[in-house]
Interface confidence: low
């Protein structure tokens, strides 16, 4: 059998195979050693008994999408049946005090591979044997502690395969410079040691994407905005737009990145080299936000231009001394750059909101018959922007960390936005008061520290003012 017979039904065209050469990978036309690595079709009854105590699940993830030319990383994690785990020596053991369907196990081992490998029958003096090989016959690499690695992972994509010896989690990175754009399929088959052979325990596949567009995400936030995820924001307050570029392999780390914004409100194009910008909308309405990200990324070199008919006359330099301005080195012929772009578009709605809230006065309310330990305090509050419909107060300790009391109530405020909020305080001392005014779309906060004095029993007949 050949690798492609074993590893998947997806057969790439000859063109795909030729143009998607992955560095360090081998052609799936190679022969597969079925004697050491048996092949079971999906639904074969032997899968049921391939692992003691249940089925092993392989979880394959990748950091796709990948910008062409960058590295994409695949991670396979093995999930063992309940109560089983891999120990420091690579053996599979039962977790202490963990009860599964079979109850508590007396034998600590599910698979004691250390004992198996100590039985070195058939090995030559180098520690290598006919069974310490991959499915294509290549010998296992002898890393320190390689004997503790008891799983063989075979990755398969684009008509090529990659073999890796590992523990219950492995990672493989692939450079995408030669990968065709679009969605591709990665398939992984996992084998475990079984004496001097291997047994398949799991198969998994996942789609990954290679793109020539920079993957771009934008987070939008604004002070006083009640719900940051609804793409509705407030007029006359700056919105912070933060651009996140999905570049897990840091391919663009040394690239120069440029952000071109159009906020859709006739303010023109805003061009920045910073990934964070602020913009204030001064009108209500719906606006189309557009961002183009440009990066000069490493890329293939164009063919050299034909030589000029004759050399140009040398001319004196007009620039300042120093041939490496601004720390940007000239690009040598073999290290060319290509422009890559990313795009983001969103429709945002701008509405009136509460822009600011201020406590302009606090007054101790004098009561005719004061409670034994209670004080009433009036907070005179003003606001700017839209008219609030609710007020909330949170009374806490002087550090503003331990909440003692929280009260919300509807309010009816005139257009001047001047209101009085009365709150009770139990006992004297210093309190932190967070006062929030809200409406459907906004929430504006102000804080103050107040001192409530001791009640003088002799002044119990003070009139309320």
């Amino acid at each position: 059998k050949r690798f492609h017979d074993v590893l998947g039904n997806e057969r790439p065209s000859a063109y795909m195979r030729e143009h998607n050469q992955l560095n360090g990978w081998s052609s799936d036309e190679n022969d597969w050693n079925e004697k050491l690595y048996p092949v079971w079709k999906r639904g074969d009854m032997r899968w049921k008994n391939s692992w003691k105590g249940g089925r092993v699940q392989a979880v394959l993830t990748s950091d796709s999408p990948a910008l062409v030319g960058s590295n994409i990383t695949f991670v396979v994690n093995l999930v063992f049946p309940r109560c089983q785990k891999e120990d420091a020596n690579g053996n599979i053991v039962y977790e202490k005090n963990c009860r599964n369907e079979a109850g508590l196990s007396a034998d600590p081992y599910v698979y004691n591979w250390t004992a198996w490998s100590e039985d070195s029958d058939g090995e030559n003096g180098t520690g290598q044997s006919h069974h310490n090989v991959f499915p294509d016959g290549k010998p296992f690499p002898h890393h320190p502690g390689w004997r503790r690695w008891n799983f063989v992972y075979v990755f398969h994509t684009l008509g090529q395969y990659f073999q890796k010896l590992g523990r219950c989690s492995v990672r493989v990175s692939v450079n995408t410079a030669n990968v065709t754009l679009g969605p591709q399929l990665m398939e992984v088959t996992v084998y475990r040691r079984h004496g001097r052979a291997y047994v398949p325990i799991a198969q998994v596949k996942d789609v990954y994407v290679v793109t020539d567009q920079i993957p771009v995400f934008v987070t939008m936030s604004q002070k006083n905005d009640r719900n940051s995820s609804d793409e509705t924001f407030l007029k006359d307050l700056p919105i912070t737009f933060d651009v996140l570029i999905h570049d897990p392999s840091h391919f663009l780390n040394y690239s120069t990145i440029n952000y071109k914004w159009s906020f859709g409100d006739n303010t023109g194009l805003f061009v920045s080299i910073n990934h964070t910008v602020n913009h204030t909308y001064v009108l209500n309405g719906t606006f189309s936000l557009n961002l183009t990200v440009k990066a000069a990324a490493p890329g293939p070199c164009p063919p050299p231009p034909p030589p000029p008919p004759r050399p140009p006359k040398p001319t004196p330099s007009l620039g300042p001394a120093g041939d490496n301005p601004l720390g940007l080195s000239e690009i040598p012929d073999e290290n060319c750059q290509i422009n890559r772009y990313g795009h983001f578009q969103a429709t945002i709605t701008i509405v009136e909101g509460i822009l600011e809230v201020n406590i302009i006065q606090t007054t101790d309310v004098l009561m005719l018959v004061p409670g034994p330990d209670s004080s009433l305090i009036d907070f005179v509050v003003t606001c700017q922007g839209s008219i609030p419909t609710e007020v909330c107060t949170i009374i806490s300790d002087p550090t503003c960390e331990i909440t003692q009391n929280a009260v919300c109530s509807p309010v009816d405020v005139d257009e001047m936005c001047l209101l009085t909020v009365r709150r009770a305080f139990n006992g004297s001392g210093t309190y932190c008061v967070n006062l929030t005014l809200g409406d459907d779309t906004s929430l504006a906060l102000t804080s103050t520290l107040i001192s409530v004095p001791d009640r003088d029993p002799a002044s119990s007949l003070r009139m309320a003012n």
Partner: antibody, heavy 120, light 107 residues
Framework: QLQLQQSGTEVVKPGASVKIPCKAS????????MNWVKQRPGKGLEWIGQ????????NDNGKFEGKATLTVDKSSNTAYIQLSSLTSEDSAVYFC?????????????WGQGTSVTVSS | SIVMTQTPKFLLVSAGDRVTITCKAS??????VAWFQQKPGQSPELLIY???NRYTGVPDRFTASGYGTDFTFTISAVQAEDLAVYFC?????????FGGGTRLEIK
């Protein structure tokens, strides 16, 4: 040797057009912005716009819309500014200046300038 | 457009004097400010980029600082060859805009 070579002087009639070249040498032409800046006699500097030869992307000063058009010819490493419907207000020295992609307005090398005189 | 207000317009100083020029942006431009020197009959030359970074080959008597809206440019000890017009320029917002210039003359 890094250079931005501009033509010396252009005398043109009102209403006509002029196309000013800026020939770059000694650096990776496609990987830097090329800016154009106007300076009227005894006056300050006015940024007209910039073009990225790698892909022809431009950023323009809206004030010069309809007046200035920026182009490049990558085969000859030359940037051009075309000024149309010329009036006496367009009489000035026009500089080309490059800037790195990541510091797109920090113009680190300048041409010697082309003087344009609009006169009948 | 961002307006860059540069002061003073004119400076008459003696060799060895310390000189400071200020530039105020009409709104925040982060640290994306450059300073240029233009000697009589010549093209402008870049002295400072990103508000405070001295360009290759620029003598260390030229320094600058600032962030947001307020920027300063200093020549610690003026020399005769510093006779020139100095411009600030913001390159945060497009269109990029220059200050009106400061003419430095030596007594």
């Amino acid at each position: 040797q890094l250079q931005l070579q501009q033509s010396g002087t252009e005398v043109v009639k009102p209403g006509a057009s002029v196309k000013i070249p800026c020939k770059a040498s000694g650096y990776a032409f496609s990987s830097y912005w090329m800016n154009w800046v106007k300076q009227r006699p005894g006056k300050g500097l006015e940024w007209i716009g910039q073009i990225y030869p790698g892909d022809g992307d431009t950023n323009d000063n809206g004030k010069f819309e309809g007046k200035a058009t920026l182009t490049v010819d990558k085969s000859s490493n030359t940037a051009y500014i075309q000024l149309s419907s010329l009036t006496s207000e367009d009489s000035a020295v026009y500089f080309c200046a490059r800037s790195p992609l990541h510091l797109r307005g920090s113009m680190d090398y300048w041409g010697q300038g082309t003087s344009v005189t609009v006169s009948s | 457009s961002i307006v860059m207000t540069q002061t003073p317009k004119f400076l008459l100083v003696s060799a060895g004097d310390r000189v400071t020029i200020t530039c105020k942006a009409s709104q925040s431009v982060s640290n994306d400010v450059a300073w240029f020197q233009q000697k009589p009959g010549q093209s402008p030359e870049l002295l400072i980029y990103s508000a405070s970074n001295r360009y290759t080959g620029v003598p260390d008597r030229f320094t600058a600082s600032g962030y947001g809206t307020d920027f300063t440019f200093t020549i610690s000890a003026v020399q005769a060859e510093d006779l020139a017009v100095y411009f600030c320029q913001q390159n945060y917002y497009s269109p990029f805009t220059f200050g009106g210039g400061t003419r430095l003359e030596i007594k």
